[in-house]
């Protein structure tokens, strides 16, 4: 069968729809896709609760599902040839709509490694037990099914549709019926939030009799991130009921005139919006929109706000939270820059020390200065370093090349320096002769 009964839950900037029908994962994804969505993501506990709510709504409408343990496709899949990764929360699976891996998961049991076929995930519902927020549906992975053969216990699927914003449901100040038609082709009379680009048909009156007015509205963006119907004042108002019907459709206060007319009003600290129904806080900072260390600063007339960060921090892309400024990006130091929370510090390379003109400057350390020389004999300072030297008859020695070691000229690389005997001395040598021989004037030969 195709996808039949559906249920809808809209929250935040997304709507979730649940459908019954024995479809393969590919067919289910195609169904969601045709209306501009994808099989649902379950990226957090909160999202799992939204999905559970829409499934509960579906189950209340569905008379009887065939299996006690029913499965509903979600948008988590692993392509053929991609192996299981037990170290990841999603175990190597990924969301069909794309997007990053998320830390939340709720696997039913340990997954078996199999890379030979595509695998798909469904939510496992035990219909013998009530759906409780504390008992969220588990994730079950298995074959993705094929047309006409969806897989065992597959009873339906959940789609997700994302929107740039939502409108509040229309408020009726008298008898009438609102029917919302969403961009994903669902009609409903009861939505907690109505997605952008939805249409609302309002039929005023009680049933067939005295149905006098009808209205048509679209949920549209009236100003940046302000989503509204553009209706002015409560709808379907009736002098017969005044404020007694649904509080006159008013968000907060309803005031009746003597002639049966009425007006909406707001409590102290709130102001009436252009729709003449809804109240909004006079102080947008009262809802603490700024996060982290950001301070909320009211704009003129208290209409909007901006978040401000302490020194060394800047607003992130959301403009609500503070992130550390990486001052090192601007290369403020002559040599090394170390970024720190709210600031930075300059460091000098080995052989240099802080100093010299300008902030963060470094100057050469004179390692050969009096009382500082690391060399046993000669020391020559260089930029950022130094080098040691030795007097004649000595060579540099030691691991760090700072020591001087006597050269044993008697075992020099050029062979014996003396014709006969050779005596090594500190920094030098001298030749000698065997008894009966005399050292020649050249100090090397024996005669």
């Amino acid at each position: 069968t195709g996808a039949d009964t559906e249920a809808v839950v809209c929250v935040g900037t997304a709507c979730y729809t649940a459908h019954s029908g024995k479809l393969s994962a590919a067919e289910a994804q195609n169904h969601c896709n045709q209306n501009g969505g994808n099989l649902a993501t379950v990226k957090s506990k909160e999202e799992a609760q939204h999905v559970q709510r829409v499934l509960a709504q579906l189950l209340r409408r569905e008379a009887a599902l065939t299996a006690r343990m029913s499965k509903f496709w979600i948008g988590l899949q692993r392509e053929k040839g991609k192996c299981l990764d037990p170290s990841l929360p999603l175990k190597g699976f990924s969301w069909v709509g794309g997007g990053e891996d998320t830390p939340y998961s709720n696997w039913h049991k340990e997954l078996r490694n199999s890379c030979i076929s595509k695998r798909c995930v469904s939510l496992l519902l035990d219909l013998s037990q009530p759906l409780l927020p504390s008992r969220l549906p588990k994730w079950s992975e298995g074959p993705c099914g094929s047309p006409g053969s969806p897989g065992s216990n597959i009873e339906g699927f959940v789609c997700k549709f994302s929107f740039k914003g939502m409108c509040r449901p229309l408020a009726l100040g008298g008898p009438g019926q609102v029917t919302y038609t969403t961009p994903f082709q669902t009609t409903s009379s009861s939505l907690e939030a109505v997605p952008f680009a939805s249409a609302a048909n309002v039929a005023c009156g009680e049933g067939d009799k005295d149905e006098t007015q009808s209205h048509y509205f679209l949920c549209k963006e009236k100003a940046p991130d302000v989503f509204d119907w553009g209706s002015s004042g409560p709808l379907c108002v009736s002098p017969k009921y005044g404020c007694n019907f649904n509080n006159g459709g008013c968000h907060q206060d309803c005031f009746e005139g003597g002639d049966g007319s009425f007006l909406c009003g707001c409590r102290p600290g709130f102001r009436l919006l252009d729709d003449l129904v809804t109240c909004a806080s006079r102080n947008p900072c009262s809802s603490s929109p700024c996060r982290g260390g950001a301070t909320c600063v009211l704009g003129p007339h208290g209409k909007n706000y901006t978040c401000r960060c302490p020194q060394g921090y800047q607003l992130d892309s959301s403009q609500l939270d503070c992130v550390d400024v990486d001052e090192c990006q601007d290369s403020p130091c002559a040599q090394e820059c170390v970024n720190t929370p709210g600031g930075f510090r300059c460091e000098c390379w080995v052989g240099y020390e802080p100093g010299g003109p300008g902030e963060g400057a470094c100057q050469d350390v004179d390692e050969c200065a009096l009382g500082r020389s690391p060399c046993a004999q000669g020391c020559t300072n260089t930029d950022g370093s130094f080098h040691c030297s030795c007097e004649e008859g000595y060579v540099l020695a030691g691991e760090d090349g700072t020591q001087c070691q006597d050269v044993d000229e008697c075992v020099g690389p050029g062979g014996p320096l003396c014709d006969s005997l050779c005596f090594n001395t500190q920094g030098s040598f001298h030749c000698g002769c065997l008894p009966g021989w005399v050292l020649a004037p050249n100090g090397v030969s024996c005669t």
């Epitope: 680009a197 509205f217 940046p224 991130d225 553009g230 909007n304 901006t306 892309s317 959301s318 403009q319």
Partner: antibody
Framework: QVQLVQSGPEVKKPGESLKISCKAS????????LNWVRQMPGKGLEWMGR????????DYNGKFKGQVTISADKSSGTAYLQLSSLKASDTAVYFC???????????WGQGTLVTVSS | DIVMTQTPLSLPVTPGEPASISCRFS???????????LYWYLQKPGQSPQLLIY???NLASGVPDRFSGSGSGTDFTLKISRVEAEDVGVYYC?????????FGGGTKLEIK
């Protein structure tokens, strides 16, 4: 391509009324705000109001409320600006302008010059 | 209403030289969504205005990259790196954060 074609220049007497048209083509007329902007001779730009043709929702600049009416006909893709009880100070060029998804006024009509003179 | 002050009123520039126009608003145009709803338009002599920059710094389609927009929540600048003869006209800044939408008074750029 997107085009906004406005009706021709008008010469009116004080106290009369006038309806300027703006024919849109090349985009989904019902799904974008259509604004009206006034430019008095040698002066700057003033936003008068707008309409969302999809459901006829309108917003007006308080300065022009009561003096102008904005309407639209979805079937023909045409927006209208009606000016009532014309005065000499209503002499201006009136532009119709599409508002895009970033709230920019991205496509402008060629303008309609209205001259009010006795 | 959001009020804006645009400076200078008139700007004579030599071709090939840079130019800069400023716009200051009575309140921040930075929305909590991180977008700044500030726009720049150019009205060439005898023509309808045309969009140059949207949301503070984004170049509209077909606009040469010698134009650039920058600024903070209330202070904004339109820069032309090298002015060309075809750039003459009146430049307007505008805000679309809050109804009624409002325009700056305009800056007339002319060639020296």
């Amino acid at each position: 391509q997107v085009q906004l074609v406005q009706s021709g220049p008008e010469v009116k007497k004080p106290g009369e009324s006038l309806k300027i048209s703006c024919k849109a083509s090349g985009y989904a007329f019902s799904s974008y705000w259509l604004n009206w902007v006034r430019q008095m001779p040698g002066k700057g730009l003033e936003w008068m109001g707008r309409i969302y043709p999809g459901d006829g929702d309108t917003d007006y600049n308080g300065k022009f409320k009561g003096q102008v009416t904005i309407s639209a006909d979805k079937s023909s893709g045409t927006a209208y600006l009606q000016l009532s009880s014309l005065k000499a100070s209503d002499t201006a060029v009136y532009f119709c302008v599409r508002g895009d998804g970033y709230w920019a006024m991205d496509y402008w009509g060629q303008g309609t010059l209205v001259t009010v003179s006795s | 209403d959001i009020v804006m002050t645009q400076t200078p009123l008139s700007l004579p520039v030599t071709p090939g030289e840079p130019a800069s126009i400023s716009c200051r608003f009575s309140q921040s145009l930075l929305h909590s969504n991180g977008i700044t709803y500030l726009y720049w338009y150019l009205q060439k002599p005898g023509q309808s205005p045309q969009l140059l920059i949207y949301t503070m710094s984004n170049l509209a389609s077909g606009v040469p990259d010698r134009f650039s927009g920058s600024g903070s929540g209330t202070d904004f600048t339109l820069k032309i790196s090298r002015v060309e003869a075809e750039d003459v006209g009146v430049y307007y800044c505008a805000q679309n954060l809050e109804l009624p939408w409002t325009f700056g008074g305009g800056t007339k750029l002319e060639i020296k």
